[in-house]
Interface confidence: low
């Protein structure tokens, strides 16, 4: 019968020719009257056999990756009678791995969006590698993330390459982040192989800030012909946040004449000042007034951001006219 | 927008020292490192050494040790370079240049840079 | 000797394509990320090419990086007059502890 081990051999050798084991008959007493041969793809090119011993070579450098088995056929024949010693056999020669392939991160470019101020611990998104390498070898595939550029803001768990928060972020001082994330092969281990990647994370914002007047004191004048309904002049108050948590409403925080409103023109963010009752410079020429401006939406959660409302100072003063029939001599 | 501004050309006879500036702006210059690169006429670009200028740690090219001291001035966002013992071979134009938030990161801004000649 | 190896001159036409090579070791190219600067005759370096591959805003797609074991490459495709210049590889080296770079390659466009 037919006479062999399992047949291995490692990939990328760089030797001309790596010698892969040998196969004989148990019949072939080596006085050399037996010849073997190899059949089969890859048999002349790839692997080649010495006909006297049986003995297979590699001669060209194998790369797993592209190809991991080799399924070949023996045969022996007895050189003085032409027949065959043996049936005709196949057998397998498995190219072993070694760790010639970095990770690669697949699914890049990696973008996140992650609400601002979230706490340690929030879950940014999870980042694969995948290597080519034989997972079943060793730790050739074996991967483990690390953080190259993030620190002290996120942080990787090694072997899911998920990426959470480690420190809390405020938009409105950086609102996107840059993290590299690093996939190690061989569970890091002398030899490893990298890879990295990028991952873009961008704050979304969260209404953490209240809205507060430019100015603490604005001077307005109206003219005493005024009409009610007349726009005296407008207050504006910043708002770091953006979007809806940015709109704001302005109203009347003290009036005691009761002789002006405020409405809120929610394209520009202005506060417009409105003469809401005629007013008389010969009665009363100037009016102080305050007004106070609250963000339009504010969660519940949110509510200690917005516990004093900013409020600003108006004085108003109001403008004589000449009225008909008055001044005498 | 983030800008490094060197200081001036500067000649020195052999043996003297030389102190380049580079003022930094547009950024939180606390976060990021600054190395500098020197250039000779008509050669490649060379390393020297790396600050961190929150802390002022510094990194120096193993050529540059015991010559170079790099120093930083946080309250005008100016770093500086000193070389001593100049000799004829250090004539070269000389950058500072932006690092990332970590030592081994690249290199994103750079100054016009700074023409030294050393001449006896 | 620099210890990143990069070929001192490489040229092509108009609307070519080129590579440049960088060659390092385990200690740089193998452990970290290579970025490419581009000089233009009289000026700072650009950064060109940064974590191997990445591009910073306002440089053109023809330009791209390439990482393989311990070895990097820029690619220039639809090559330009304006792309004339010095380009050079650089790397941290976790052995030497510093920043190396390669001796940069003079990129001539062939009229």
């Known amino acids: 019968g037919w006479v062999w081990n399992q047949f291995f051999v490692p990939e990328e050798m760089n030797t001309t020719s790596h010698h892969v084991g040998r196969l004989r008959s148990d019949l072939d007493n080596g006085n050399n009257s037996f010849q073997y041969k190899l059949l089969g793809a890859g048999a002349g090119s790839t692997f080649i056999i010495d006909e006297r011993t049986g003995d297979i070579y590699a001669i060209e450098k194998l790369d797993r990756e592209e190809r991991s088995l080799y399924i070949l056929r023996a045969q022996v024949i007895d050189i003085t009678t032409g027949r065959a010693v043996e049936p005709e056999s196949e057998f397998v020669i498995k190219v072993s791995d070694i760790n010639d392939n970095e990770p690669k991160f697949l699914d890049e470019p990696y973008e996140a969006i992650v609400p601002e101020m979230s706490p340690e611990g929030t879950l940014v998104i999870q980042v694969t590698a995948s290597d080519a390498d034989d997972p079943s070898s060793g730790n050739n595939a074996r991967l483990l993330y690390s953080l190259l550029q993030g620190q002290p803001y996120f942080s990787v768990e090694p072997t899911t390459g998920v990426i959470r928060i480690s420190s809390k972020m405020d938009r409105e001082l950086q609102d996107e982040y840059w993290v590299i994330i690093q996939a190690k092969d061989m569970i890091g281990q002398p030899g490893a192989l990298s890879g990295t990647t990028s991952v873009l994370i961008k704050l979304s914002d969260v209404n953490d800030n209240k809205p507060i007047f430019k100015e603490s004191l604005y001077r307005l004048t109206v003219s005493e012909s005024a009409p009610t309904g007349t726009s005296i002049g407008t207050i504006m108050a910043y708002d770091n946040d953006i979007g809806e948590n940015a709109e704001m409403d302005y109203s009347i925080e003290e009036d005691d004449s009761q002789t002006f409103d405020i409405i809120t023109n929610h394209e520009t963010q202005e506060g417009i000042v409105i003469l809401k009752k005629k007013v008389n410079f010969e009665h009363q020429n100037h009016y102080g007034i305050r007004a106070k401006v609250k963000n339009h939406h504010v969660d519940e959660q949110l509510m200690k951001y917005h516990t004093e409302a900013s409020t600003t100072f108006i004085k108003i003063q109001v403008e004589d006219v000449d009225e008909p029939g008055g001044g005498g001599s | 927008q983030v800008q490094l501004v060197q200081s001036g050309a500067e000649v020195k006879k052999p043996g003297a020292s030389v102190k380049v500036s580079c003022k930094a702006s547009?950024?939180?210059?606390?976060?990021?490192?600054m190395s500098w690169v020197r250039q000779a006429p008509g050669q490649g670009l060379e390393w020297m050494g790396i600050?961190?200028?929150?802390?002022?740690?510094?990194t120096y090219a193993q050529k540059f040790q015991g010559r170079v001291t790099m120093t930083r001035d946080t309250s005008t966002s100016t770093v500086y370079m000193e070389l001593s013992s100049l000799r004829s071979e250090d004539t070269a134009v000389y950058y500072c240049?932006?690092?990332?938030?970590?030592?081994?990161?690249?290199?994103?801004?750079w100054g016009q840079g700074t023409l030294v000649t050393v001449s006896s | 000797q620099s210890v990143l190896t990069q070929p001192p001159s490489a040229s092509g036409t108009p609307g070519q394509r080129v590579t440049i090579s960088c060659s390092g070791s385990r200690s740089n190219i193998g452990s970290n990320f290579v970025n490419w600067y581009q000089q233009l005759p009289g000026t700072a370096p650009k950064l060109l090419i940064y974590t191997n591959n990445q591009r910073p805003s306002g440089v053109p797609d023809r330009f791209s990086g390439s990482k393989s074991g311990t070895s990097a490459s820029l690619a220039i495709s639809g090559l330009q007059s304006e792309d004339e210049a010095d380009y050079y590889c650089?790397?941290?080296?976790?052995?030497?502890?510093?920043?190396?770079f390669g001796g940069g390659t003079k990129l001539t466009v062939l009229s």
């Open positions: 650089a790397v941290y080296d976790e052995s030497l502890q510093g920043w190396v």
């Open positions: 240049a932006r690092g990332g938030i970590k030592l081994w990161l690249h290199f994103d801004y």
């Open positions: 600050i961190h200028p929150s802390g002022g740690d510094t």
């Open positions: 547009g950024y939180t210059f606390t976060s990021y490192y």
